[in-house]
């Protein structure tokens, strides 16, 4: 906590300049007027304040704007952004992509994933939806940041924007996010030819349902194993050995390498060993011949 003292007359601050680097914490607290600081925020980033001094300046802004900073201040936070917590950022209303760009640049090289995620969330809320300009900004200045958004926020992406998303932007997306993005991508790329469609839809396939994966198996797409491994477990389990063989084409041999990993392991357990043997890969763990499979979940549903 910063102790309160009165400002010595010779230390009175009339503008934000580099002379302030010589002020002790209590002098900054006593002598810097919060309104002056807010009005001259654009000067702060040029001054090498210590993190300790930045804490004092942040404290002054917090007192002036307890409900959250206005965008005119946020835009010029510069390295003071490094002092913000996700709780601070949640109070902001940000609509300008220039503000977003400025703060994304500041955060580069610092461990600020939670703050950046919250900032992006505030921008999406402020702008009303995740529009093309916002997606373009994220892909340019913060690859992978798209996946920091919640499925609820991602649901505001219009299908027309999906084309701006690059494969690397989806690398850190989880299943729930891909569940939201996949139907949009399917809609966005629906008029493309088979091979072109597959190239475009591939990064989103972690959200594809079984019927769509089955449909792809009929199109000679030769899905690579990395993409197959990212498919939803629920989408892979109902596939037959023949469908998986068609889906992977020459990449089917990779199943042996991934034999112990989900979803391959779980899929193997659901196949008849006879069928697995037809692949000639030595996959083990299928259902032995002569065994009857009872789907108890169906029986429970009927009772």
């Amino acid at each position: 906590d910063v102790e309160r003292t009165t400002c010595p007359p010779e230390k009175e601050v009339h503008e934000i300049d580099e002379s302030l680097i010589f002020y002790k914490k209590r002098e900054l607290e006593a002598c810097v007027d919060a309104a002056l600081l807010a009005a001259q925020m654009d000067r702060v980033d040029a001054i090498p304040f210590t993190y300790e001094q930045l804490d004092v300046l942040k404290h002054k802004l917090d007192e002036l704007y307890p409900q959250g900073y206005p965008e005119s201040v946020i835009r010029h936070l510069g390295h003071l952004f490094l002092k913000m917590s996700p709780e601070d950022i949640r109070k902001w209303n940000v609509t300008s992509l220039e503000t977003l760009k400025a703060l994304l640049k500041v955060s580069k090289g610092h461990e600020m994933s939670a703050q950046v995620a919250t900032l992006i969330d505030r921008v999406v809320v402020g702008r009303g939806q995740l529009d093309k300009d916002t997606v373009d900004t994220l892909t340019a200045f913060c690859p992978g940041c798209l996946c920091s958004l919640s499925p609820e926020r991602l649901s505001s992406v219009p299908p027309s924007v999906i084309g701006a998303v690059r494969p690397q932007d989806l690398d850190t997306c989880g299943p729930r996010q891909l569940d939201v993005l996949y139907p949009k991508a399917r809609l966005a790329f629906q008029n493309m030819s088979g091979s072109e469609y597959f190239v475009k839809i591939r990064p989103f396939l972690g959200g594809a349902p079984t019927e769509d994966v089955k449909a792809l198996s009929q199109q000679n797409v030769s899905m690579d194993l990395a993409t197959f491994m990212k498919l939803r477990r629920e989408a892979v389990l109902p596939l037959t050995v023949a469908e998986v063989q068609k889906l992977l084409g020459p990449h089917v041999e990779g199943l042996k390498v991934e034999e112990q990993h989900s979803p391959v392991r779980d899929w193997i357990l659901k196949q008849r060993q006879d069928d697995l043997d037809t692949l000639g890969l030595g996959l083990q763990g299928g259902i032995p011949n002569g065994y009857l499979i009872l789907d108890l979940s169906v029986r429970e549903a009927l009772s």
Epitope: E18, D45, P48, T50, H79, K105, V106, G109
Partner: nanobody
Framework: EVQVVESGGGLVQPGGSLRLSCAAS????????GGWFRQAPGEQRELVAS???????KYADPVKGRFTISTDTAKNTVDLQMNSLGPEDTAVYYC???????????????WGQGTQVTVSS
């Protein structure tokens, strides 16, 4: 990994001189920002002298004309020559380095462990 190490502190009589040196590894002072802070017992830390290509050389009022900050680019050090020392200069002196970002503004900061300067007869 960035390291900032001070040397040269000690006991000196009033009116005497001392030279503090700060050596950095993992960061160059050239083009960045180097400074000396001090903290007297029961007081808050204060900047004594600093230098950077962006802001030039700056001194706190109490040390103007007595202290001189300089850099040795070849050795990557920031030195503080302290003359006419008085008991009020007794403090732990800290070296400070701050990265100047190519886009403007300042990045990470680095502090030394501090070196004790005692002025007493």
């Amino acid at each position: 990994e960035v390291q900032v190490v001070e040397s040269g502190g000690g006991l000196v009589q009033p009116g005497g001189s001392l030279r503090l040196s700060c050596a950095a590894s993992g960061i160059t002072f050239s083009g960045n920002y180097g400074g000396w802070f001090r903290q007297a017992p029961g007081e808050q830390r204060e900047l004594v002298a600093s230098m950077s290509s962006a802001l030039g050389t700056k001194y706190a009022d109490p040390v103007k004309g007595r202290f001189t900050i300089s850099t040795d680019t070849a050795k990557n050090t920031v030195d503080l020559q302290m003359n006419s020392l008085g008991p009020e200069d007794t403090a732990v002196y800290y070296c400070y380095a701050r990265v100047r970002l190519s886009r403007g503004g300042w990045g990470s900061e680095y502090w030394g462990q501090g070196t004790q300067v005692t002025v007493s007869s």
